[in-house]
């Protein structure tokens, strides 16, 4: 039986040109976590595996970094950033958690005037 | 489902080498990275080396660096392990592993290969 939660950033916004970081969190399972996957709709933007560590795809390596801790970091945001991004904790032996964030990318201008989504 | 086979175990003397090498079959396109594990006598299986199809950067055990070498033929699908300076302490079945994006680790094991170093 799942008992795990995955809290997560929730609705994020952040600044064209900027960094964000991802984050989830999964809490009440004592299940075992074997990988993280970062991915963005239907693209995998990293790996994080308890044997071998971070990987991070080719066609983002110079804009994603490992971290903090099981999170991601997005780099020199571009507006077509916006979107869903999705980490999937794959955990033994409970199976597959999914958490969900919703990015949304600003215009510099738009965001120093208050964002929707704005980071405590 | 993969399939593993491992092959190229056997019995050599400490400071000795040998290569073992690993065929995947049944490989699907979101395996992101082949390995190693080992299990001596008694004692859980640990990992020792792995390495990514995308790229073929390595992760060793640090009990193995410098004396093992991880390789891989992704065309093949076959990994290799190069063993070294081989010490006692590396006796033990040695298990073909394979990481995908899907599942993680496999969840399946081959029958392993065994090495035993004599001192």
């Known amino acids: 039986m799942m008992t795990g939660t995955i809290e997560t950033t929730g609705n994020i916004s952040a600044e064209k040109g900027g960094s964000i970081i991802l984050q989830c969190h999964l809490s009440s399972t004592t299940a075992q976590v074997t990988q993280v996957n970062w991915e963005q709709q239907d693209q995998l933007l990293a790996i994080c595996n308890a044997d071998l560590g971070w990987h991070i795809s080719p066609s983002f390596k110079d804009r994603v970094a490992p971290g903090p801790g099981l999170g991601l970091t997005l780099q020199s945001l571009t507006v077509n950033d916006t979107g869903e991004y999705f980490c999937i904790y794959h955990t033994y032996p409970d199976g597959t958690y999914t958490g969900r964030i919703f990015l949304e990318v600003l215009e510099s201008s738009v965001a120093e005037h208050g964002a929707r989504f704005q980071i405590p | 489902e993969v399939q593993l086979v491992e092959s190229g175990g056997g019995l050599v003397q400490a400071g000795g080498s040998l290569r073992l090498s690993c065929a995947a079959s049944?490989?699907?396109?979101?395996?992101?990275?082949m390995g190693w594990f080992r299990q001596a006598p008694g004692k859980e299986r640990e990992f020792v080396a792995g390495?990514?199809?995308?790229?073929?950067?390595?992760v060793y055990a640090d009990s193995v660096k410098g004396r093992f070498t991880i390789s891989a033929d992704n065309a093949k699908n076959t990994v290799y392990l190069q063993m070294n300076s081989l010490k006692p302490e590396d006796t033990a079945v040695y298990y073909c592993?394979?990481?995908?994006?899907?599942?993680?680790?496999?969840?399946?094991w081959g029958q392993g290969t065994q090495v035993t170093v004599s001192s």
């Open positions: 592993a394979t990481w995908t994006t899907t599942w993680g680790r496999n969840r399946d």
């Open positions: 049944g490989v699907t396109l979101d395996l992101y990275a």
């Open positions: 390495i990514w199809r995308s790229g073929g950067s390595t």
